[in-house]
Interface confidence: medium
């Protein structure tokens, strides 16, 4: 889940937490981040990054415990870090990335946190103990569980699924403002001696905020915006307002270099090296910055500032945000990128504007014809119609364009000649006194998936050729084999003759040459990402998923692929989870991806699996997965015993009881059974997956998974008074597959 520096999730906790098993995996480039808060009126648990170090604060009743990671290990390095905090039986343990970092005794009281859990930030919670805590997380929580339950569900609309690209974007990646409420906040812009703000702006917004920095005194600010398509800067300093306009239009969708320079004497805005500045009147004295530098949009406070201002900076403009992008951002000479932002709203990594406009406007017309060439290509918006000047020869009467374009058809991965029929003149060249060699083509934008190869000396570098070259088959398109069924070339066509003709032909006309790619069906293949050997424990089952084998087919989606298991169907060890006992001789790629299939070992030597996969037209060559069944080995990992007061109950946790097996990449079922009668109490298991308030009942068997989930306990039921500590010897046996380890 992605948190953008001002977001959080809340999770209710209705009852006190006796044990805590908290696991977080996060990544951030910010040295400050609030990761998690479990909040009560006084009791609380806080995990935060501060100066790149992880700090844990646990307050239970009157007691306070603090743990932190070493100063030399900074966790604000954009790399995912795994944090595990356990509080069990009066002992707190913190580990990061598998290394024990700190542990300490804690009071045995439960943690009373009725206000709930706050993930990534504290929202509007205003509790005294939250003063001085870190900023909300700007980064990713890849996982967050408390006592085995996810804390990241359900996501709210402003916390996004997955880990956003912008958190790993380097300084050379543009800030994309995708609107309508986009905003990026950076550390304050200090202008004590002088301040500079530089970026390359691409936008079509005629009215939009660009930069806002509030001052320490109420009402002071620096504000730069686009006003009626031009740059404007306003500096409000105490009693005086300085207002500056620049005359270079910027709302044209083209990149413009913008520089804002301010010092005690003057303010200067420069667009594409064209400067506008105030006279050296010294109005500006130093503006003490307060809060963040806001780019591309305004928060509520900044909007209020501007709406209250006597210049009447219009409400529409203050509520809108920039639609466009800023590249090469630098603040006081220091490069800044999305990674350095303190918070972002509705941002994208990179500047996609030009490309999208181009794709949508120019390419969209041809989508319908991506697989079959139409009888007649629809009227194109390119080239712009040419209006011939008066007094030209009659051949140019009703002339609008030089060429009629037809799509070039090429096989996937193949080649096709550019021929006369693709670029046919609309008029008789001889009558117009034009030669084919005078009709000059230049490639202004190449195809995405192929190359126009010119068999003419020097032409390949210049990307220029003539209509005569086309007739002589000197230009051919070579497709790169990718799967898209349509592409295009942008050609500029001009005429070099010195005869009377419309001036648009001298200047050149732009044409789109659509390229239609006829797909070729590639057969699928089976690949084994971790090698073609699978190890399974005897008499157990192991999931078969894409981590074991998968299909690779460049031109078929998973939905269109079917696997077959070759060989006799009787005794076939592949089954669907929900149809135990029924061999699965055929299954879909979707089923494989969904984890619906298992390999079941029922004894004897394991059966190898030979598969093939088909896309409905072609099948892959058979591929064999070698399967080896090994006898389960069970080893006691922990068996510590418990101490508890008579009449009380105590959970049995992995720290008290756990076993290890020799399973390789296999989550095996480990069953514990009580083999002897108990004298002083009973073993109990909790229903409903560990929900507080769920019933406990006596049990003679439980799984290791139950222990891991805190669902097993020993209850002392002995009513007699003893002058000594009684000892209950709990005799257990462990079973994995058909292997049993007794007298545990």
């Amino acid at each position: 889940a992605s948190f953008f520096g001002e977001n959080h999730l809340e999770v209710p906790v209705a009852t006190a937490l006796t044990d805590i098993d908290l696991q977080l995996q996060f990544s951030t480039s910010q040295p400050e981040a609030l990761l998690l808060l479990a909040a009560g009126p006084a009791d609380h648990l806080l995990l935060q990054l501060y100066s790149g170090r992880l700090q844990v604060r646990l307050v239970l009743g009157q007691e306070e415990l603090r743990l932190q990671t070493p100063a030399e290990t900074l966790l604000s390095d954009s790399i995912p870090h795994t944090v595990v905090l356990t509080v069990v039986e009066g002992w707190a343990t913190l580990s990061v990335d598998g290394f024990l970092n700190a542990s300490s005794a804690v009071p045995g009281a439960p943690l009373e946190v009725p206000y709930g859990l706050f993930v990534g930030g504290t929202g509007t919670l205003g509790l005294p103990y939250l003063r001085g805590t870190s900023r909300p997380l700007r980064g990713c929580l890849h996982a967050a569980t408390l006592n085995g339950r996810s804390l990241l569900r359900p996501l709210t609309p402003d916390v996004h699924e997955g880990c956003a690209e912008e958190f790993s974007a380097s300084d050379d990646v543009a800030l994309g403002f995708s609107g309508p409420h986009s905003l990026a906040a950076f550390p304050a812009w200090g202008t004590q001696d002088e301040g500079t703000l530089e970026f390359t702006l691409t936008t079509q917004s005629r009215q939009a905020p660009l930069a806002f920095q509030a001052g320490g005194r109420r009402g002071d600010f620096i504000y730069v915006d686009i006003f009626e398509g031009h740059l404007r800067a306003v500096v409000e300093k105490g009693q005086g307002t300085v207002l500056l306009h620049n005359s270079v239009p910027v709302a044209d969708g083209q990149p413009h270099e913008v520089s804002v320079h301010i010092n005690a004497h003057r303010l200067e805005i420069s667009v594409d090296q064209y400067p506008t500045h105030t006279s050296n009147r010294g109005v500006l004295s130093y503006l003490e910055p307060r809060g963040s530098l806001l780019l591309g949009g305004l928060d509520a406070e900044a909007s209020r500032h501007l709406q209250e201002h006597r210049l009447g900076l219009t409400p529409e403009a203050t509520n809108a945000s920039l639609l466009g992008c800023m590249e090469d951002l630098s603040v006081n000479g220091q490069r800044r990128g999305l990674r350095e932002a303190l918070l972002t709203r509705n941002m994208a990594a990179g500047c996609r504007l030009e490309e999208e406009e181009y794709e949508d406007d120019a390419y969209g017309h041809y989508e319908a014809f991506s697989t079959l060439a139409p009888e007649a290509w629809p009227a194109m918006e390119l080239p712009e119609p040419c209006v011939p000047e008066p007094g030209l020869p009659p051949v140019f009467a009703n002339f609008t364009q030089l060429l009629t374009i037809s799509p070039l058809v090429v096989a996937e991965g193949g080649t096709a000649w550019l021929e006369w029929r693709h670029v046919q003149p609309t008029l008789d060249l001889m009558e117009a006194e034009l030669r084919k060699s005078q009709v000059l083509f230049s490639v202004t934008r190449g195809a995405r998936h192929g190359e126009l190869e010119l068999d003419i000396p020097g032409a390949q570098a210049r990307k220029m050729f003539t209509l005569l070259d086309v007739v002589n088959r000197k230009a051919r398109f070579i497709h790169d084999g990718s799967e898209d069924t349509s592409d295009q070339l942008v050609l500029e066509v001009s005429v070099t003759a010195r005869v009377p003709m419309p001036s648009c032909l001298r200047r050149g006309q732009t044409y789109l040459l659509p390229i239609q790619v006829n797909p070729v069906n590639d057969p699928p293949h089976i690949i084994f990402p971790h090698g073609s050997l699978m190890v399974i424990l005897e008499h157990t089952q192991k999931p078969l998923g894409p981590e074991v084998f998968q299909a690779y087919d460049p031109d078929s989606a998973c939905e269109g692929l079917t696997f077959q298991v070759l060989g006799t169907s009787s005794g076939l060890p592949v089954e669907r989870r929900d149809q135990p006992g029924e061999p699965a001789t055929e299954f879909s790629c979707r089923e494989l991806e969904a984890g619906s299939l298992v390999y079941v070992h029922r004894g004897g030597p394991a059966q190898d699996l030979t598969f093939r996969v088909s896309d409905g037209l072609q099948a892959s060559p058979p591929a064999t997965l070698k399967v080896v069944a090994i006898r389960p080995a069970i080893q006691i990992h922990r068996s510590t015993g418990l101490r508890l007061a008579q009449g009380s109950a105590m959970p049995i946790l992995p720290a008290n009881l756990s076993v290890e097996t020799n399973a390789v990449g296999q989550d095996v079922s480990v069953l514990f059974r009580v083999t002897g009668a108990l004298q002083f109490g009973e073993l109990q298991k909790q229903g409903a997956g560990g929900v507080e308030g769920a019933e406990w009942w006596a049990t003679q068997a439980f799984h290791q998974r139950d222990v891991e989930q805190g669902r097993v306990r020993y209850l002392s039921t002995d009513p007699q008074h003893h002058a000594y500590d009684t000892v209950e010897n709990l005799a257990l046996e462990v079973q994995v597959g058909q292997e049993i380890l007794s007298n545990l």
């Epitope: 809340e10 999770v11 209710p12 906790v13 209705a14 009852t15 909040a39 009725p114 206000y115 709930g116 859990l117 929202g123 509007t124 919670l125 408390l146 006592n147 339950r149 996810s150 804390l151 569900r153 359900p154 996501l155 709210t156 609309p157 997956g689 560990g690 929900v691 507080e692």
Partner: antibody
Framework: QVKLQQSGGGLVQPGGSMKLSCVVS????????MNWVRQSPEKGLEWIAE??????????YYAESVKGRFTISRDDSKSSAYLQMINLRAEDTGIYYC?????????????WGQGTTVTVSS | DIQLTQSPSFLSASVGDRVTITCKAS??????VAWYQQKPGKAPEPLLF???YRYTGVPSRFSGSGSGTEFTLTISSLQPEDFATYYC?????????FGGGTKVEIK
Amino acid sequence: QVKLQQSGGGLVQPGGSMKLSCVVSGFTFSNYWMNWVRQSPEKGLEWIAEIRLKSNNFGRYYAESVKGRFTISRDDSKSSAYLQMINLRAEDTGIYYCTSYGNYVGHYFDHWGQGTTVTVSS
Amino acid sequence: DIQLTQSPSFLSASVGDRVTITCKASQNVDTNVAWYQQKPGKAPEPLLFSASYRYTGVPSRFSGSGSGTEFTLTISSLQPEDFATYYCQQYNSYPLTFGGGTKVEIK
């Protein structure tokens, strides 16, 4: 014994208003997030609103279909949750249930009121 | 919004039958799915949560499985009191949504 006792409901004309109440007993009301879920033959079960705790600033979430028309609220001192409905439409007809969840296991509804019928018709 | 599609909508079965109801989500919801049982004139009651965990007091004949987009509720041996309508619900993201329901009737 947990109990969610609902009141309100009845017949109302399109464009009219109505307030539903839900009184809770058997658990610490102030620790539980409260919700309203409605049921109609046309749309089946439909979650419509959620209100969180005082400590969560009484955060509210609504289904798109009722946003701006329905307001969920709570009074912890009375262990009560409310649903104020204005500008009612025919499609708001159905049985309205008050529900709760209070466990970090997940946002599923572990306690339900008996339901109250709202009919919007002229 | 995440759509939940339950199948079948109606199901006729006899006492003792094994019954399976499926719930398909329009996008990945991990295991954040709950199942409810509703009898005529009554409010729904929780059966399972987190796709496979039984709620307190729910008989062991009810079980659930699945993760991602496909979930199943299985009643291993149908009892007379199990004839009712069953609903799935996702709590992976807002708005919380329910399936259309499966009515289990006596054959």
